[in-house]
């Protein structure tokens, strides 16, 4: 059967807690991606920035989820209206905003 | 030491609103990743959740219940307030309030309560 | 909503016996499952949270166990003071919803 968006969401949001708690080295070698805005498509705009992140086994489980909650394809190099305009963070600082905001929607029922 | 406790009338009309008040000592809801429930429990009965408030003021009801509901913090009096609209006998329960915390995951579990405040609502 | 189902509603144990008592919910709610305490004229207490974890001062006779829809709480020897009615609950998200309770009566 298929999984409650909500549970969905839970899943997401545990996979980037395990990854902000078991980071030892810098994630992904310190990768830097474009930052995006968190306001509205949060799951595209996301899976945007991290998919031109490669060889990094850390966050590939979190780039499937994202797929999972994004309608459109996405592809590396393709980039939306929803990223910040020049500025990139290190991945580590990407996920850690991404799980505060994700956190918040689930708090407030928004799982879609 | 983390206590809660609840005030509320004791005895309501049918019709008329509820408010109940839960003082929080020991912790803060300006804290991140605190919350507060309320849960009521009918005479002889079960236990069900009525709503939740989190540290920055996102709010949850129980469906059933929620266009009768209201809950709202006053963090300066370290205070959550509940009202519940036209009352009815059925609404008659020990109220209880509630502390989450949450951090890292989502837990939503209470782990300490109020002692609890009887409402009866009968005219 | 999620309901949540637990049997036996009442049971009758000896002091010394190891007591189950089962929580059913009508989803995967991925261990997100609390259970609680409540002793007549009182309010409830948090016993165990997420499937397994001991909430700070609960003796260590009470453990909790399950995955998926399925969980139980197990009192492995049984006191006088153990004598309560158990909820359990689920934690995944709002609505929050309880078990019917299970009372536990000394023989």
């Known amino acids: 059967s298929p999984v409650p968006p909500s549970t969905a969401l839970k899943e997401l949001i545990e996979e980037l807690v395990n990854i902000t708690q078991n980071q030892k080295a810098p994630l992904c070698n310190g990768s830097m991606v474009w930052s995006i805005n968190l306001t509205a498509g949060v799951y595209c705009a996301a899976l945007e920035s991290l998919i031109n992140v490669s060889g990094c086994s850390a966050i590939e489980k979190t780039q499937r989820m994202l797929n999972g909650f994004c309608p459109h394809k996405v592809s590396a190099g393709q980039f939306s209206s929803l990223r910040v305009r020049d500025t990139k963070i290190e991945v580590a600082q990407f996920v850690k905003d991404l799980l505060v905001h994700l956190k918040k929607l689930f708090r407030e029922g928004q799982f879609n | 030491e983390v206590t809660l406790r609840e005030s509320g009338p004791g005895l309501v009309k049918p019709t008329q609103t509820l408010t109940l008040t839960c003082t929080l000592y020991g912790f803060s809801l300006s804290t991140s990743d605190m919350g507060v429930d309320w849960i009521r429990q009918p005479p002889g009965k079960g236990l069900e959740w009525l709503a939740h408030i989190w540290w920055d003021d996102v709010k949850r009801y129980n469906p059933a219940l929620k266009s009768r509901l209201t809950i709202s913090k006053d963090t300066s009096k370290n205070q959550v307030v509940l009202k519940l609209t036209s009352v009815d006998p059925v609404d008659t329960a020990t109220y209880y309030c509630a502390r989450t915390v949450s951090s890292g995951y989502i837990y939503y579990a209470m782990d300490y309560w109020g002692q609890g405040t009887l409402v009866t609502v009968s005219s | 909503d999620i309901q949540m189902t637990q049997s036996p509603s009442s049971l009758s144990a000896s002091v010394g016996d190891r007591v189950t008592i089962s929580c059913r919910a009508s989803q995967d709610i991925r261990n997100y499952l609390n259970w609680y305490q409540q002793k007549p004229g009182k309010a409830p207490k948090l016993l165990i949270f997420?499937?397994?974890k001991l909430h700070s001062g609960v003796p260590s006779r009470f453990s909790g166990s399950g995955s998926g829809t399925d969980y139980t709480l197990t009192i492995s020897s049984l006191q006088p003071e153990d004598i309560a009615t158990y909820y359990c609950?689920?934690?995944?998200?709002?609505?929050?919803?309880f078990g019917g309770g299970t009372k536990v009566e000394i023989k």
């Open positions: 609950q689920q934690g995944l998200t709002p609505p929050l919803t």
């Open positions: 997420y499937t397994s």
